[in-house]
Interface confidence: low
């Protein structure tokens, strides 16, 4: 039976009898916040092989080990994923090993073990046989190894059942738990199954079968399961459905999406029955199962009931999400907020049209209007009293309305009304009149040429850089020295700068008046000698990324109505030259014969340049005797190694560790502070803790049923 | 608790009109799909279609297109049924059920007690 | 359409009997098969959804099995407040389909 779409599991252990007829979870499985220690020796579900997304785990009080209730779980798709992990085993209290002896492939995602005080055999598992890439995996705060004493079968009575594998330059016997071995498939397999037996699988077989080599009989499907048989593809007329079957047009046509969402029933795209079009795609009408390509961003149109959408929030913005036409009027009304110009864009920047009138007051948390970033129509279908399509009103922090140089913005009816927003420039202003057509309709007292630009530089001169150079992590630049009509006004300058992978940034992307800004900022004080260029040293850049730089002059003078004339320059888009790339990733070598090794790798997370070849490196080894000259599977002290460098892990260390030569030849030694880099990382796994835990705890816990 | 009050029975000539209201309370109407379903005397249920209530979409069975209308009014958590044009065999009970979405079916978890609508010249 | 047979339109029992209704589907529907309870004074209860499922609040005294196109609900131990009409329906393919329900009456 195909149990789903998900199960969840929690609060009542009794629940879990919901899994007794499961072959295949096609969703994911939660097993969580069970808070009463259990007697589980009664539940046990061998029918259940593999779950298409996840597996997680948390909370559950007395359960010791997951072998007796999932003995024959196989596979784990990771079809979908928790927060990047296909396996999440969190604070469980009582766990003791995980013990899924025929878990054999876990398909996509990594595995995230993490809190369990009393948890062991997670050093005898070999993940790099079930995963492909084991450099994602997070195991930690487990019991520690030193505590468990984890024997596999058979190591004490001197009898090893199990296979041994080499993890970390170490070779050790693999197992799950001290009566399960990890089951390994002869090296002739490949990277085929096999049964019980060791005899190889069909190719199309993943994690186990029942017989060799048939494409009928095994466990799970390498690619998509149809009619009794695995299949590389889905045959014609037939289509992938949740990632590992294959299911007819009636079957797709007959199944309705979630409540909540629009529910049209599923589509055929790209070979796939899926729940809606992908980005960038639409239905081909609304009762349409097939998707066509949006032209731009695909069309989606929100009304407000009450005619007129207050945006005083970024909850009241999150409504908006997605929406690409506004039937109504926009009210924004900003008065602070911690990051808002960004979460305003998130939300609103796929808004073209707005039907009715926008009126932006009080809105002193916003330095620019770019977070409508895709505005190209106001129809001002509804207008405010005295036909104001376009009203702006009291906003202190105003600076920008939008880039004009890349913007379309039409208003179709109605004027536009500017008051009391200090930082505006009505140069500005005039420029979205010409822009959106409006120019002319306005009357004199529309645009307040007193009230608006009041304290901004509005007569801006231009200041132009006169040299510029980079190396890997450095870029150093120079300007000319910007000379207002009295020079004692010039105070200093300011350069602003940020990676920006695409020339199209613009001086207000991110910024609002509550201290949020995309921007690095960087305090440049005039040189003492009027003669020397101005000019900074950027460093702590990374290797061969692209920057936008741009500098402003900061300036007293107050001249021309009134105004503060300023100087900035344009935007200077400059990259950072190459540098050595960070080590390529998850290598992996097996043998597949007596006289040749099969190498794989990933990328560099950090290439730092454009690679262009891999160099591999191999020598052979002698065998190091020294691993025959301990029994490894008794349970003494094993000797410490003596390292060639005299160092030894520090929690060896019992005598005065104290020497004064790190490193040297006196013994052993002091542990060397941390480094920069390594107390940033320790921060930074920190904080990614914190992160991995907020999402764990918004994800499962939910307001009770009613 | 969580229930669906219908409203009252009804007798109709042939021709005539009829409007049916089912009133939801104890859950949010937009979170569960609202269905519609015929009982004609002494016979089995028939599914007339449901109506989506997060969006106002209705979807008919083909039996029970033309004449029938599905609506909502969000704000007072009512559905409704309007029979345009009666005729002698619509004399039955109709039911709102809510549903639930199953993993690609959807089974009605909480009925309303019905209204019974007699046509009759 | 799928059609639902219910071939027995009624039956009766004793208190404390097991009770057997079956319903057939004129295609295979998935296990997608669900059973509600209507009492003669028309209310509607549902009892078991997705062939074996029992919905919340329902006593364990019901039980539904099948599969393909033979589905069953049981009810052992019959009680006073079980006599009523049974229906079965296919959640299987639009437009969701009924039998013509089966009655137990008391012996």
């Known amino acids: 039976e195909i149990c789903g779409p998900g199960i969840d599991i929690r609060n009542d252990y009794q629940q879990l009898k919901r899994l007794e007829n499961c072959t295949v979870i096609e969703g994911y499985l939660h097993i969580l916040l069970i808070s009463k220690a259990e007697d589980y020796r009664s539940y046990r579900f061998p029918k259940l092989t593999v779950i298409t997304e996840y597996l997680l785990l948390f909370r559950v009080a007395g359960l010791e080990s997951l072998g007796d209730l999932f003995p024959n779980l196989t596979v784990i798709r990771g079809w979908k994923l928790f927060y990047n992990y296909a396996l999440v085993i969190f604070e469980m209290t009582n766990l003791k090993d995980i013990g899924l002896y025929n878990l054999r492939n876990i398909t996509r995602g990594a595995i995230r073990i993490e809190k369990n005080a009393d948890l062991c055999y997670l050093s005898t598992v070999d993940w790099s046989l079930i995963l492909d890439a084991v450099s994602n995996n997070y195991i930690v705060g487990n019991k520690p190894p030193k505590e468990c004493g984890d024997l596999c079968p058979g190591t004490m009575e001197e009898k090893p059942m199990c296979e041994k594998t080499t993890i970390n330059n170490e070779y050790n016997y693999r197992c799950w738990t001290t009566n399960r071995c990890q089951k390994m498939c002869p090296s002739t397999c490949g990277k085929r199954a096999c049964t019980e037996n060791n005899e190889c699988c069909h190719p199309e077989c993943l994690g186990s079968c029942s017989a060799p080599d048939n494409d009928t009989a095994c466990v799970a499907c390498r690619h998509y399961y149809y009619a009794g048989v695995c299949v590389p593809a889905c045959p014609p007329n037939t289509y992938r459905f949740e990632g590992w079957r294959c299911v007819d047009r009636d079957f797709c046509a007959n199944i309705l999406s979630a409540e909540s969402s629009d529910s049209e029933g599923f589509v055929i795209h790209d070979g796939e029955c899926m729940q809606e079009c992908p980005s960038g795609f639409i239905r081909n009408g609304s009762q349409s199962m097939y998707c066509i390509p949006c032209e731009g961003p695909c069309p989606k149109v929100c009304e407000e009931e009450k005619k007129t959408k207050t945006i005083d929030s970024v909850t009241s913005a999150q409504m908006l999400q997605g929406c690409t036409i506004f039937k109504g009027n926009l009210l924004i009304n900003i008065r602070r907020g911690n990051n808002i110009a960004s979460e305003l864009e998130n939300f609103m920047g796929l808004i073209e049209v707005v039907t009715g009138y926008v009126k932006i007051r009080h809105s002193h948390a916003l330095v620019s209007l770019s977070f409508l970033k895709n505005l190209r129509l106001i129809l001002g279908e509804e207008q405010l009293e005295g036909n104001y399509s376009f009203y702006v009103l009291d906003n202190q922090n105003l600076q920008q309305l939008w880039d004009w140089d890349h913007r379309n913005l039409t208003i179709k009816a109605g004027k536009m009304y500017f008051a009391f927003n200090p930082k505006l420039c009505v140069s500005e202003i005039y420029r979205m009149e010409e822009v959106t057509g409006t120019k002319g309709r306005q009357s004199k007292g529309d645009i307040n040429t007193r009230n608006n630009g009041e304290r901004a530089s509005c007569e801006s001169d231009v200041l132009h850089f006169t040299s510029t150079t980079t190396s890997k992590n450095r870029i150093i630049i120079t300007w000319h020295r910007y000379r207002p009509p009295d020079y004692r006004d010039l105070i200093s300058f300011t350069v602003y700068y940020k990676e920006a992978p695409f020339k199209n940034v613009t001086e207000y992307d991110g910024q609002d008046a509550c201290g949020s800004n995309s921007w690095n900022m960087v305090d440049v004080d005039l040189p003492p000698n009027k003669d020397v260029e101005p000019g900074i040293l950027l460093h702590g850049l990374k290797p061969w990324t692209q920057y936008a730089v741009y500098v402003k002059a900061v300036t007293l003078t107050m001249v021309e109505n009134d105004h503060i004339r300023g100087a900035k320059s344009e935007i200077l888009y400059i990259r950072t030259n190459a540098s050595v790339p960070s080590i390529p990733l998850d290598v992996l070598s097996a043998s597949n014969s007596s006289s040749q090794l099969i190498v794989k790798w990933n990328p560099p997370s950090l290439p730092n340049g454009n690679l262009s070849y891999y160099i591999v490196r191999w020598q052979r080894q002698p065998q190091d005797g020294y691993l025959y000259r301990h029994n490894y599977c008794s349970k003494d002290k094993i000797p410490i190694r003596k390292y060639a460098d005299g160092t030894i892990d520090i929690e060896e260390v019992t005598e005065n560790p104290k020497t004064e030569v790190c490193g040297g030849e006196k013994g052993p030694c002091c542990a060397c502070p941390k480094t920069e880099a390594e107390k940033q990382a320790e921060k930074e796994e920190a904080e990614y803790r914190k992160v991995f835990e907020n999402f764990l705890h918004n994800s499962i816990f939910v307001p009770r049923p009613e | 608790q969580i229930q669906l009050v219908q409203s009252g029975p009804e007798l109709k000539k042939p021709g005539e009109t009829v409007k049916i209201s089912c009133k939801a309370s104890?859950?949010?109407?937009?979170?569960?799909?609202m269905n519609w379903v015929k009982q004609a005397p002494g016979k089995g249920f028939k599914w007339m279609g449901w109506i989506n209530t997060n969006t106002g979409k209705p979807t008919y069975s083909d039996e029970f297109k033309g004449r029938f209308v599905f609506s909502l009014e969000t704000s007072a958590s009512t559905a409704y049924l309007l029979i345009n044009n009666l005729s002698n065999e619509d004399t039955a009970t109709y039911f709102c059920?809510?549903?639930?979405?199953?993993?690609?079916?959807?089974?009605?978890?909480?009925w309303g007690a019905g209204t019974t609508v007699t046509v009759s010249s | 359409d799928i059609q639902m047979t219910q071939s027995t339109s009624s039956l009766s029992a004793s208190l404390g009997d097991r009770v057997t209704i079956s319903c057939r589907a004129s295609?295979?529907?998935?296990?997608?098969l669900t059973w509600y309870q209507q009492k003669p004074d028309g209310t509607v209860k549902l009892l078991i959804y997705y062939t074996s499922r029992l919905h919340s609040g329902v006593p364990s005294r019901f039980s539904g099995s099948g599969s393909g196109t033979d589905y069953s609900l049981t009810i052992t131990n019959l009680e006073q407040e079980d006599f009523a009409t049974y229906f079965c329906q296919q959640g299987n393919t639009l437009p969701w389909t009924f039998g013509e329900g089966t009655k137990v009456e008391i012996k």
């Open positions: 295609q295979d529907i998935n296990n997608y």
């Open positions: 104890g859950y949010t109407l937009a979170n569960y799909g």
């Open positions: 059920a809510r549903s639930i979405y199953y993993y690609g079916s959807r089974y009605f978890n909480v």
